[in-house]
């Protein structure tokens, strides 16, 4: 009879056994192993019990103790299990970022192991377990779905296996995976509301602004804000689930048309864009031309007045004929034309809104000098003694200088108050001089006595 | 559909003048800002000169400046590039292109016309 | 500086992604836009904006930036994308309206 101990081995991948091989016959012709396993004998005296060492044992097997004895042969089998943990504990790639309601695949390969049997693959989130399968096929895979909810937000999810060899007097062995870290966000299916001018004047600032709400984690949100090629960069302020992005807008002559105005924002892998036109345009105030800005009395004046070549202008409230950007009037200057305002309103429609601009420009009349009997009578009669005020005002452009006098000597105080006396009395001669001549004009002062009775 | 046609390339002696047409159709000509690219036979492209839509501002590379003028005609749909005092280093295929603003990026482009400066 | 740098030569495996890049100040402030020219003809847009391609323009071609650089990324490139590729920027140093970079010739392979 042979026999064989341990009759039962659990040892690691690359392991070493000691196996006796025993006969109960006191002297076999033949006491041995077969395995295809490297094996060393130890020597020991007697010759019915041989001990071998196994060494370098990479997978189960059952070596087989022979002996030949008188009464016959016979064997007996030991049998090996080699343990090993898994190679490879591996969860599929995600991309880090996933949407809130969405069904996330975990999946979970493990690459080698032994024993199968006692072999554990728990999918985790935290230390809470979702899913715990016997690892089966190489490489085994565990799968489980998971509702992304908002407080999965930072979770991190793994797979560990087991190893459980505590049955067979050894201990528990686990392997871990690499962590998944989960970020979850809420990006609205609604675009962002973009508030700006719709028109916006070459050389001007104007403010744009760009609002979400509805987004988790807000702090996570990336806005991105341009016109046209130019990046611009807005002060971002977040409340609890929303945004707004303020930025100002400088535009010069090279923005000049139509441009695209984009706020774009992007949450975890989607974006949500909004787009907006916006019309930069340039529209310089009208001119007001005078053939001269001062001209003589009776001289024929010429007003012009030029716009945008799209606008349209009135000049004094007169439309261009035809309507255009250019309107123009004749007159013939009279002083009453002195001071007189000629006002040019131009109008030029930018993307369906009327934008007005005005100009006006003063025509200075050189006339006179006038002295006539409304504004310098010719004759006065004052009591004597009594207050008067002389009044003689002389009409021009440029203002003439008045002087009457008396003989060329005797001046008559024109504007001041005066105690009427006989000397006052008499015919003066008014002469009003400017740089556009002289008038010369008659007033005689008469004084009446009081009467003695 | 847009489309950009230049004319008035060829053969000019150096020191002449040359004037460029750019025959637009397909876009309203007026709402758009035109420009002049360049680029000599086997080298990269070259900006030479803008106008904006309405034709109030006029923009050009230092190496034309004061040489070329740019202007339009848009009750004619057309772009203008009058080049005087030739050089040269002014030999290249002539490109006009659109631009839904004076500083943007080019949205169509003509076939282009051969100017030639001969010493 | 108003200068716009791009590698002269590039080279791509058919189907396979290439990158093409042009660095430049002027960057930080505006966006790129992109231009294939194939030899003898006229170039054509292929991206503008932060990446927005016109009508037409494969999605294949996309485009992004950061700092002062900005990228021209064909993905599964194919024969027909074999030509000249310049990017375009709005001038920031104020001495041109808008300028080029030199170019980059794109081969694909295979």
């Known amino acids: 009879q042979t026999s064989v101990s341990p009759s039962k081995v659990i040892l690691p991948r690359g392991g070493s056994v000691l196996v006796t091989c025993s006969t109960s016959c006191d002297q076999p012709k033949l006491l041995g192993i077969e395995t295809p396993l490297p094996k060393k004998e130890l020597l020991l005296p007697g010759n019915n019990r041989k001990v071998y060492e196994l060494s370098n044992v990479q997978e189960d097997s059952q070596p087989m103790c022979y002996s030949n004895c008188p009464d016959g042969q016979s064997t007996a089998k030991t049998f090996l299990t080699v343990y090993w943990t898994p190679e490879r504990v591996e969860l599929a790639p995600l991309p880090s970022w996933q949407p809130v309601g969405k069904n996330l695949t975990l999946r979970c390969q493990v690459e080698g192991g032994a024993p199968r049997a006692n072999l554990t693959v728990v999918l985790l989130r935290g230390e809470k377990e979702l899913k715990r399968e016997p690892a089966v096929g190489e490489p085994a895979e565990v799968t489980t779905t998971v509702l992304v909810r908002r407080d999965h937000h930072g979770a991190n999810f793994s797979c560990r296996t087991e190893l459980d060899l505590r049955p067979q007097g050894l201990e528990l062995f686990e392997n871990t995976s690499a962590p998944y870290q989960l970020q979850t966000f809420v990006l609205p299916a609604t675009p962002p509301q973009l508030v700006s001018p719709r028109v916006l004047e070459v050389d001007t600032q104007g403010t744009v602004v760009c609002s979400l709400d509805g987004l988790f984690p807000v702090s996570e949100a990336q806005v991105h804000l341009a016109l046209g090629d130019q990046r611009l960069n807005p002060t971002v302020t977040y409340g609890n689930d929303s945004f707004s992005a303020k930025a100002s807008v400088s535009v010069t002559a090279e923005d000049e048309g139509t441009q695209r105005l984009t706020c774009a924002v992007i949450l975890g892998n989607q974006s949500q864009e909004t787009l907006q036109t916006v019309t930069i345009y340039s529209f310089p105030a009208p001119n007001v031309i005078l053939t001269k800005p001062e001209v003589s009395e009776g001289t024929e004046v010429t007003v012009k007045c030029e716009a945008h070549p799209r606008a349209k202008v009135t000049l004094n409230g007169v439309p261009a004929q035809p309507l255009g950007p250019r309107a123009q009037l004749l007159l013939k200057a009279t002083p009453e034309d002195n001071g007189r305002s000629f006002s040019c309103s131009a109008t030029l429609e930018v993307a369906g809104q009327l934008i007005h601009k005005n100009q006006t420009r003063e025509l200075r009349v050189l006339y006179g000098p006038r002295l006539d009997e409304r504004d310098c009578p010719g004759n006065w009669t004052w009591p004597e003694n009594s207050q008067q005020t002389p009044m003689c005002q002389a009409w021009g452009n440029p203002l003439p200088e008045l002087k009457c006098l008396k003989d060329g000597t005797f001046p008559l105080p024109i504007g001041e108050s005066v105690t009427v006396t006989r000397d006052l009395e008499g015919t003066y001669l008014c002469r009003a001089r400017s740089t556009q001549g002289e008038v010369t004009r008659k007033v005689t002062v008469n004084v009446l006595s009081p009467r003695y009775e | 559909q847009v489309q950009l046609q230049e004319s008035g390339g060829g053969l000019v002696q150096l020191g002449g003048s040359l004037r460029l047409s750019c025959a637009a159709s397909?876009?309203?000509?007026?709402?758009?800002?035109m420009s002049w690219v360049r680029q000599a036979p086997g080298k990269g492209l070259e900006w030479v000169s803008a106008?904006?839509?309405?034709?109030?501002?006029?923009y050009y590379a230092d190496s034309v400046k004061g040489r070329f003028t740019i202007s339009r005609d848009n009750s004619k749909n057309t772009l203008y590039l009058q080049m005087s005092s030739l050089r040269a280093e002014d030999t290249a295929f002539y490109y006009c292109?659109?631009?839904?603003?004076?500083?943007?990026?080019?949205?169509?482009w003509g076939h282009g016309t051969l100017v030639t400066v001969s010493s | 500086s108003s200068e716009l740098t791009q590698d002269p030569a590039v080279s791509v495996a058919l189907g396979q992604t290439v990158k093409i890049t042009c660095q430049g100040d002027?960057?930080?402030?505006?966006?790129a836009s992109w231009y294939q020219q194939r030899p003898g003809q006229a170039p054509v847009l292929v991206i503008y904006?932060?990446?927005s391609r016109p009508s037409g323009i494969p999605d294949r071609f996309s485009g992004s930036s950061s700092g002062n650089t900005a990228s021209l990324t064909i993905t599964g490139a194919q024969a027909e994308d074999e030509a000249d590729y310049y990017c375009?920027?709005?001038?920031?140093?104020?001495?041109?309206?808008?300028?080029f970079g030199g170019g980059t010739k794109l081969t694909v392979l295979g």
């Open positions: 292109a659109n631009s839904a603003y004076t500083g943007g990026w080019y949205d169509y």
């Open positions: 397909g876009f309203t000509f007026s709402s758009y800002a």
């Open positions: 106008i904006s839509g309405s034709g109030g501002s006029t």
């Open positions: 002027s960057l930080r402030t505006y966006y």
């Open positions: 904006g932060e990446n």
């Open positions: 375009n920027s709005r001038d920031s140093s104020g001495n041109h309206l808008r300028v």
